[in-house]
């Protein structure tokens, strides 16, 4: 799978994580920090 950094317009897309662009799947993906979940890493869990 080809991945790259997200475009600059997606700055802030991932609330608590790193945004990566999955080129072949035509979508952005959030790699969440420890303790966070959700499509955009918006949920905190203990």
């Amino acid at each position: 799978v080809s991945i790259t950094k997200c475009n600059s317009d997606m700055n802030g897309y991932c609330l608590h994580g790193q945004c990566i662009y999955l080129v072949d799947m035509s979508q952005n993906y959030c790699r969440c920090e420890v303790g966070y979940t959700g499509v955009r890493c918006e949920h905190f869990y203990l």
Epitope: T4, N7, S8, D9, M10, G12, Y13, L15, Y21, V23, S26, Q27, N28, V39, R40, E42
Partner: antibody, heavy 116, light 106 residues
């Protein structure tokens, strides 16, 4: 199956406002950005602006600043584009477009006609 | 706002010809360019994103290339069903469409 269903065609008088809706099904708009694009008859595509429904953050093309308002109601999974002070040059098909989780998934378009 | 200058605005070519459309950005867009095909009365159809990634179901005669500010879209062998208007879109920093290229059969 993911869908963006837009409101029906509108006819407005110059100076009036129009509000076009874009209802999402099959996905949560909070996971995406919703863009708005328009196309006047026989003309090219023109990006108007976008909203991040989760953060309620908006960005607009400079030429539309002060005249366009993009909002989202996450409880109904619907985005809206309101354009005020309409003039004949605003006659166009208006499209909502999902981006973020999937590259550019388009609604069917809404024709807005501005005529006296 | 980033400006996208697309050329030519129209072209006429024969079936089987190689067709090339270019888009020049006013600043580096880091390969974040997409190409759309639009036929009369229809919504635009995404052909290519991230400069060269073909969408599922799009024929391999369509291709894209480029980097920095200069990008190219190519139809290697024009077919009658390719008659349409083609648009580039930069999506690095917000969004800007090129002016479009109307492709006709000679």
């Amino acid at each position: 199956q993911d869908q963006l269903v837009q409101s029906g065609a509108e006819v407005k008088k110059p100076g009036a406002s129009v509000k076009v809706s874009c209802k999402a099904s099959g996905f949560n708009i909070k996971d995406t950005y919703i863009q708005w694009v328009r196309q006047a008859p026989g003309q090219g595509l023109e990006w108007m602006g976008r909203i991040d429904p989760l953060r309620r953050n908006t960005k607009y093309r400079e030429k539309f600043e002060g005249r366009v308002t993009i909002t989202a109601d996450t409880s109904t999974n619907t985005a809206y584009m309101e354009l005020s002070s309409l003039r004949s040059e605003d006659t166009a098909v208006y499209y909502c477009v999902r981006s973020g989780t999937l590259f550019d998934f388009w609604g069917q378009g809404t024709l807005v006609t501005v005529s006296s | 706002d980033i400006q996208m200058t697309q050329s030519p605005s129209s072209l006429s070519a024969s079936v089987g010809d190689r067709v090339t459309i270019t888009c020049k950005a006013s600043q580096d867009i880091h390969k974040y360019i997409a190409w759309y095909q639009q036929k009369p009365g229809q919504a635009p159809r995404l052909l290519i994103q991230y400069t060269s990634t073909l969408q599922p179901g799009v024929p391999s005669r369509f291709s894209g290339s480029g980097s920095g500010t200069d990008y190219t879209f190519t139809i290697s062998s024009l077919q009658p069903e390719d008659i349409a208007t083609y648009y580039c879109l930069q999506y690095d920093n917000l969004r800007t469409f090129g002016g479009g290229t109307k492709v006709e059969i000679k």
